[in-house]
């Protein structure tokens, strides 16, 4: 099949030339390129009125190719689209459009989000944390002994940042009221430095169980200060034991 | 002669990150797009995504969007894929191969990647 | 996504008998007048090796007796006459829509 394709080209191209330039398998010195070696795509490229043949490794941006026994070709993309493997499955679109399983869209359908860095159409990517870890030790102004009252601190990280339309993450610290060890502090002890250290007291309209780490406070928004006396401290004394309110920065 | 050259088997643990490897050679690396292919125990075959080596450009299946990353070394020639927070349903046989006007014509051999606490 | 079914899962065929496989599609894969719809033959520890492409294309080098024929949803491979190295698991995949996608395989066995 092929080489009576071949002798009919070369019986309408009398000039036809076998010491072809640039993978050309067939070319004549006017129309150039008549067919390719394998793996190569023929395309027509215009120069001034006349068409040339040509023989190339891939096809330019904007065409496809497509593999027939005798020849591979270049056919265009669709309109609104850059790069693609077929008419059907467009891989970059044109300015304006988002690519979505291989369409090219004025708008995201619903459920999906533009990403206007990548022109796609995304999936909404809710935010995903871990499990908390551990409570720190409990501790007051740094020292995890000679006090009745402390705090104690735990985290948790992100693994799954949300995206525009996402929900937003939940607290990731969690601070609570607990006892310090009841033990007095040697002599120059002072204990663990812990991030609770400079603490600002509980704010008002703020539950007053809630202190915030300084490493939520910098990302915070600040709160006014809350003032108690010792009667509803007191009051509240085994609530806060168990309480705990969380505190985090928004992502 | 077109020849695609994976690395070795991938021997991980669970919630880590392996990068496989698929070395080209023997036609000009940037003329075909790259694709990789996922096989389950000699059953069938999962399409995972494609990156076109002369300008990066990638695109995913949506099973494995937020997990699977595609890049390109043009200068050694090689594709590669990475897979984050593994889990046991990601042991298989990952396969690199070119894109041909719509079919894939060469294939690397296979890389085994199983994960194991 | 396109789902491709394959049809008989295995078959046992006698050595010089005809085998014939058949992959059906959720919808076309056909566009402009092309199908794409492709065949690849894979032996145990090997990768798959591409046989027909677009529905009905002998890849260079893959023996004349595989045939490959049908358009829109309704594909075909024939094997005839099958010889002892056939004998391996064939699919078939779409190249029309984003994802890409297989057929779950036929395994092709010799009596």
């Known amino acids: 099949q092929n080489a009576s394709r071949g002798r009919r080209q070369r019986r309408m191209h009398p000039n036809v030339s076998q010491g072809c330039q640039g993978g050309c398998a067939t070319c004549s010195d006017y129309n150039g390129c008549l067919s390719c070696k394998p793996r190569l795509f023929f395309a027509l490229e215009r120069i001034g009125m006349k068409q040339i043949g040509v023989c190339l490794s891939s096809c330019p941006s904007g065409y496809y190719g497509t593999r027939y026994p005798d020849i591979n070709k270049c056919t265009k993309c669709k309109a609104d689209c850059d790069t693609c493997f077929n008419k059907n499955f467009c891989t970059k679109c044109k300015s304006g459009f988002y690519l979505h399983l291989g369409k090219c869209l004025d708008n995201c359908p619903e459920g999906l989000e533009a990403n206007n860095h990548t022109m796609e159409c995304v999936s909404i990517v809710h935010c995903e944390v871990s499990e908390w870890n551990p409570w720190s030790p409990c501790t007051k102004k740094g020292k995890t002994c000679g006090f009745k009252r402390g705090t104690e601190t735990r985290v948790r990280e992100i693994i799954q940042h949300p995206s525009a339309k996402g929900n937003l993450c939940p607290p990731t610290n969690e601070t609570r009221k607990c006892t310090v060890q009841r033990k007095k502090c040697q002599k120059g002890e002072r204990g663990k430095k812990g991030r609770e250290r400079k603490r600002k007291k509980p704010n008002k309209g703020e539950s007053k169980e809630a202190i915030p780490d300084s490493k939520s406070l910098e990302s915070s928004k600040e709160i006014p200060e809350q003032r108690e006396n010792k009667q509803q401290q007191k009051k509240r004394k085994v609530q806060d034991k168990q309480k705990s309110v969380s505190v985090s920065t928004v992502h | 002669q077109v020849q695609l050259k994976q690395s070795g088997p991938e021997l991980v643990k669970p919630g880590a990150s392996v990068k496989i490897s698929c070395k080209a050679s023997?036609?000009?690396?940037?003329?075909?797009?790259f694709h990789w292919v996922k096989q389950n125990h000699g059953k069938s075959l999962d399409w995972i995504g494609y990156?076109?080596?002369?300008?990066?450009?990638?695109g995913y299946n949506q099973k494995f969007k937020n997990r699977a990353t595609l890049t390109v070394d043009t200068s050694y020639s090689t594709a590669y894929l990475e897979v984050r927070r593994l889990t046991f349903e990601d042991s298989a046989v990952y396969y690199c191969?070119?894109?041909?006007?719509?079919?894939?014509?060469?294939w690397g051999q296979g890389t085994t990647l199983t994960v194991s606490s | 996504d396109i789902v491709l079914t394959q049809s008989p899962a295995s078959l046992a065929v006698s050595l010089g008998q005809r085998a014939t496989i058949s992959c059906k599609a959720s919808q076309s894969v056909d566009y402009d007048g092309d199908s794409y719809m492709n065949w690849y033959q894979q032996k145990p520890g090997q990768p798959p090796k591409l046989l027909i492409y677009a529905a009905s294309n002998l890849e260079s080098g893959i023996p004349a007796r595989f045939s490959g024929s049908g358009s829109g949803t309704d594909f075909t491979l024939n094997i005839h006459p099958v010889e002892e190295e056939d004998a391996a698991t064939y699919y078939c995949?779409?190249?029309?829509?984003?994802?890409?996608?297989f057929g779950a395989g036929t395994k092709l066995e010799l009596k």
């Open positions: 191969a070119t894109y041909f006007a719509n079919n894939f014509d060469y």
């Open positions: 023997g036609y000009t690396f940037t003329s075909y797009t």
């Open positions: 990156i076109y080596p002369s300008n990066g450009d990638s």
């Open positions: 995949q779409q190249s029309n829509e984003d994802p890409l996608t």
